[in-house]
């Protein structure tokens, strides 16, 4: 898989592959994987990809199911890169406050908050 | 501050306090704090709260600015609680796949993806 494929296209293709291979993936009836209990997905990327690792180790590889796991691995790589960019730029306090304000604003309007 | 205050109300109040105390907070001209370079805030909560800690240690405390940092500490506590819930429930593969599909769907439609 060329890593040059845009991440957005990669995500779309992975969604399709996930749908295609669902029957194969759920064949293991006894396997249990941690599932986050809320929808703030970005907070749980580590656990999601640990779960993917568990699933991959229990799935017979070959054909396009292999491509599915390769895609998921590239998505993980992208997210790891994004995480690295969390602390790269050192800025003046006013810029940090603008980012913090935006973060809280998004939390206020978009997060699923259960008290 | 009662921890029973709903998190959504806490976030709203914190946004207001942030605006009120901006001039005091930016007074340190030479301080530099890491600022994430993308809008996927949830990936960067650790760095954001490290930055808040740096800012708090450089800010003269007292009055409602103290309340601002207490609020931010409660918001951190809430997020830490959410992170704990990422791996608490072990579920069958089909439920994990549903969550993974939703995660990729959200990534596809809502994330700011730069290739």
């Amino acid at each position: 898989i060329p890593t040059e494929i845009p991440t957005s296209a990669l995500v779309k293709e992975t969604l399709a592959l996930l749908s295609t291979h669902r029957t194969l993936l759920i064949a293991n009836e006894t396997l249990r994987i941690p599932v986050p209990v809320h929808k703030n997905h970005q907070l749980c990327t580590e656990e999601i990809f640990q779960g993917i690792g568990t699933l991959e180790s229990q799935t017979v590889q070959g054909g396009t199911v292999e491509r599915l796991f390769k895609n998921l691995s590239l998505i993980k790589k992208y997210i790891d890169g994004q995480k690295k960019k969390c602390g790269e730029e050192r800025r003046r306090v006013n810029q940090f406050l603008d980012y913090l304000q935006e973060f809280l604003g998004v939390m206020n309007t978009e997060w699923i908050i259960e008290s | 501050i009662p921890t029973e205050i709903p998190t959504s109300a806490l976030v709203k109040e914190t946004l207001a306090l942030l605006s009120t105390h901006r001039t005091l907070l930016i007074a340190n001209e030479t301080l530099r704090i890491p600022v994430p370079v993308h809008k996927n805030h949830q990936l960067c909560t650790e760095e954001i709260f490290q930055g808040i800690g740096t800012l708090e240690s450089q800010t003269v405390q007292g009055g409602t600015v103290e309340r601002l940092f207490k609020n931010l500490s409660l918001i951190k506590k809430y997020i830490d609680g959410q992170k704990k819930k990422c791996g608490e429930e072990r579920r069958r593969v089909n439920q994990f796949l549903d969550y993974l599909q939703e995660f990729l769907g959200v990534m596809n439609t809502e994330w700011i993806i730069e290739s």
Epitope: E88, E89, R90, R91, R92, V93, N94, Q95, D98, Y99, Q101, E102, G105 | R22, T23, I26, A27, N28, E29, T30, R32, V35, P36, V37, H38, K39, I112, E114
Partner: antibody, heavy 117, light 109 residues
Framework: QVQLQESGPGLVKPSQTLSLTCTVS??????????WSWIRQHPGKGLEWIGY???????YYNPSLKSRVTISVDTSKNQFSLKLSSVTAADTAVYYC?????????WGQGTLVTVSS | SYVLTQPPSVSVAPGQTARITCGGN??????VYWYQQKPGQAPVLVVH???DRPSGIPERFSGSNSGNTATLTISRVEVGDEADYSC???????????FGGGTKLTVLG
């Protein structure tokens, strides 16, 4: 390497609104570590800061121009814009867009706007 | 609002040292940035945070800042250094950017 390019009319009539757009390439306007700024330079004079905007839409303006200036951002097009209303001959200048981290790190090449009837 | 004052012009012979000042109330407590601008071109940063040089800027360019004056020093001046030089600070009381009026450096001869 981030590049900025100003675009807009080079001639504006007095009392009208000057409108310029800056297109950012080689980087995202949603970069949390950058502000996006407009600066102008009257012929033979020094640099004058007009204002800047954060990707979230927070704006900061030069007090001497605040009543006439609007800066906006379009993250989907990776662009930000300047509008300066009620222009006079005194607004004739080279207008620069620039990215602003801790300092002005990348600049457009500048565009001369003349206010004349 | 905060004001920065620069001399309109400074002249120096090649090989000599040029000093361009930027005055402001208690400027020593702020970070100062210096830009070089040649005719028909956009400004280029030559010194940031009082005395740090970006990559690609010769060591001949240096800066200092204390009290009410920041100084850009160009040693062993070359003809190619002839340009306008502007200082810049942030006014943290308002989150505003402030530029000095600019100084024209003329290299004699």
């Amino acid at each position: 390497q981030v590049q900025l390019q100003e675009s807009g009319p080079g001639l504006v009539k007095p009392s009208q609104t000057l409108s310029l757009t800056c297109t950012v390439s080689g980087g995202s306007i949603s970069n949390g570590g950058q502000y996006w700024s407009w600066i102008r330079q009257h012929p033979g004079k020094g640099l004058e800061w007009i204002g800047y905007i954060y990707y979230s839409g927070s704006t900061y303006y030069n007090p001497s121009l605040k009543s006439r200036v609007t800066i906006s951002v379009d993250t989907s097009k990776n662009q930000f814009s300047l509008k300066l209303s009620s222009v006079t001959a005194a607004d004739t200048a080279v207008y620069y867009c620039a990215s602003l981290g801790n300092w002005f790190d990348y600049w457009g090449q500048g565009t001369l706007v003349t206010v004349s009837s | 609002s905060y004001v920065l004052t620069q001399p309109p012009s400074v002249s120096v012979a090649p090989g000599q040292t040029a000093r361009i000042t930027c005055g402001g109330n208690n400027i020593g407590s702020k970070n100062v940035y210096w830009y070089q601008q040649k005719p028909g071109q956009a400004p280029v940063l030559v010194v940031h945070d009082d005395s740090d040089r970006p990559s690609g800027i010769p060591e001949r360019f240096s800066g200092s800042n204390s009290g009410n004056t920041a100084t850009l020093t160009i040693s062993r001046v070359e003809v190619g250094d002839e340009a306008d030089y502007s200082c810049q600070v942030w006014d943290s009381s308002s989150d505003h950017v402030v530029f000095g009026g600019g100084t024209k450096l003329t290299v004699l001869g």
